[in-house]
């Protein structure tokens, strides 16, 4: 429970948290985990420890492994681990994402992108930062202390964005980067509530009695990323579990995002051997979200069969 | 048949809370949203707020953000609309109604709310 | 929020005759689906709030085909095509199309 992933580039400086919080006034030792081996204080080695910090000044490949804290106080010791890795920098733009920080979404209105892990440094500003790898120039990007600005935010401002900055630590300086990702919330013409395209409201099916049929609901929620969208078949007012037929079963469809951005999604009620009793139910495609639900009501006709002979 | 059965008038103190409650019958309270809307003496009706059932969210306009709480519970078929920080212009009939997806098709009694000195 | 206007506000009527309540809306209610969501709600006298008319056009179950809907985007309207005594009360549109829903100010309909 009390382990921290962290994670660095090599020549880098890489500082880690103990997991384990305590008053300033604790002492903190740290250990190599695999060897039991205390992590020196002294400020002159390349790793070292400083009260809850553990200082790699800059990192190396082989320092990855998992480091043990132990934090003492008069009448209790906690234990946390800090599990970190290293990694060798790439010579491509691209950030893989295990050197990703947590994913920040911004809109219009809100667009912040804070630089994660820089409160641990002793850094000065401005902070350097660059989007997919592009400094970033125009008056829309400001750098303000640990956070980057961006006015008028667009979906194309959405990417990977990298901060930079330099720690000094006793008249030494060492480089730090860091980036996650920005997502936009399009809040222009944003619709709220859950759109069902099909089926029609009211639709009447027509299936053939003994064969097999499928009805798809499908649903649009809004653009981007949606939270607590769904959609379900329901009969007679009932989820299909509750209601108990096994010939009638749905399955989720495809996740879709159309070119205009819009997120849907598709469930498909399958209804095996289709029989007399089914074309008394009533079909409801239900579709919500956050803001609300719609539903659409389907009944089953039976399709005559075509007559060969007349 | 379809019945939403609300709870019986209040009066309240400014600055008090309100909590109504709404008991769904004759149909399946889990499958169906709740919206409540109120209306002043004399006045027009006012969505307040709504609960979207399965993913047991609730949704509130931004004038009663903070002030107004939706739940339901599904083992007894209820709904219920605390209003908190009452103020005498909070004096209404408080409805609960059915969402049968994006309109109300059943409505309750009404529930009057007196805020009063 | 999205503004409802109704007109008129109050509409004296004569039994047999017809009527028709407009409501208009500050932004479309057509939504990419084709469904206009906009509803029609009456109240009678001391009475709750009832649906007449879903999706701009659809009667509801157990209302008299006397009551139609039409209109698309920002215009609405509801017809009555011959009114009885039990039809006065104060009617509202609402739409359901933006967040938040939100009522019109209501037509009071009354027997002249």
């Known amino acids: 429970k009390f382990s921290k992933q962290s994670w660095g580039l090599e020549n880098e400086a890489l500082i880690v948290r103990c997991p384990r919080q305590g008053k300033p006034s604790y002492t903190v030792d740290w250990y190599y985990s695999q060897t039991n081996k205390s992590i020196p204080t002294q400020e002159r080695n390349r790793v070292f420890a400083s009260g809850q910090l553990l200082k790699f000044l800059p990192a190396a490949v082989a320092d990855s492994g998992i480091y043990t804290c132990i934090v003492r106080s008069p009448t209790f010791n906690r234990t946390g681990y800090a599990n970190v890795t290293i990694y060798k920098k790439q010579s491509d733009c691209n950030v893989p994402d295990y050197l990703m920080y947590s994913t920040v979404s911004g809109s219009e209105k809100n667009s912040k992108i804070y630089c994660p892990t820089i409160d641990l440094y002793n850094w000065t500003a401005p902070l350097e930062w660059f989007k997919n790898c592009q400094a970033l120039q125009g008056s829309r990007y400001r750098a303000h202390k640990s956070f980057l600005v961006i006015d008028n935010v667009m979906t194309e401002d959405a990417g990977d964005y990298t901060c930079k900055f330099i720690h000094n630590e006793n008249g030494a300086n060492y480089s730090v980067t860091a980036t996650r990702s920005f997502t936009v919330k399009d809040e222009q013409g944003f619709s709220l509530f859950p759109v069902i395209g099909a089926p029609a409201q009211n639709e009447i099916k027509e299936v053939e009695i003994g064969k097999n049929a499928n009805l798809t609901c499908s649903a649009c929620f809004g653009k981007g990323t949606q939270f607590l969208a769904a959609v379900l078949w329901q009969l007679n007012g009932t989820k299909i579990t509750d209601f108990g037929e096994p010939r009638i079963q749905q399955e989720e469809g495809q996740n879709q995002s159309f070119s205009n951005g819009l997120a849907c999604l598709d469930m498909v009620l399958r209804i095996a051997d289709v029989k007399e009793e089914d074309l008394l139910l009533q079909y409801d495609c239900l579709a919500l979200n956050l803001h609300g639900l719609r539903r659409h009501t389907v009944r089953l006709s039976r399709k005559n069969p075509i007559d060969h002979h007349s | 048949q379809v019945q939403l059965v609300q709870s019986g008038a209040e009066v309240k103190k400014p600055g008090s809370s309100v909590k109504v409650s709404c008991k769904a019958s004759?149909?399946?309270?889990?499958?169906?949203?709740v919206a409540w809307v109120r209306q002043a003496p004399g006045q027009g009706l006012e969505w307040m707020g709504g609960?979207?059932?399965?993913?047991?969210?609730?949704n509130y306009a931004q004038k009663f953000q903070g002030r107004v709480t939706i739940t339901a519970d599904e083992s007894t078929s209820t709904a219920y609309m605390e209003l908190s920080s009452l103020r005498s212009e909070d004096t209404a009939v408080y409805y609960c109604?059915?969402?049968?997806?994006?309109?109300?098709?059943?409505w309750g009694q009404g529930t009057l709310v007196t805020v009063s000195s | 929020d999205i503004v409802m206007t109704q007109s008129p506000l109050s509409l004296p009527v004569t039994p047999g005759e017809p009527a028709s309540i407009s409501c208009r809306s500050s932004?479309?209610?057509?939504?990419?689906?084709?469904?206009?969501?906009l509803d029609w709600y009456l109240q009678k006298p001391g009475q709750s709030p009832q649906l007449l008319i879903y999706?701009?056009?659809s009667l509801q179950s157990g209302v008299p085909d006397r009551f139609s809907g039409s209109g698309s985007g920002t215009d609405f309207t509801l017809k009555i095509s011959r009114v009885e005594a039990e039809d006065v009360g104060v009617y509202y549109c609402?739409?359901?199309?933006?967040?938040?829903?939100?009522f019109g100010q209501g037509t009071k309909v009354e027997i002249k």
């Open positions: 999706a701009a056009s």
């Open positions: 609960f979207v059932p399965i993913i047991g969210s609730a």
């Open positions: 932004q479309s209610l057509l939504h990419s689906n084709g469904y206009n969501y």
């Open positions: 109604a059915r969402d049968y997806g994006g309109n109300l098709d059943y």
């Open positions: 004759g149909f399946s309270f889990s499958t169906y949203g």
């Open positions: 609402m739409q359901g199309a933006h967040w938040p829903p939100t």
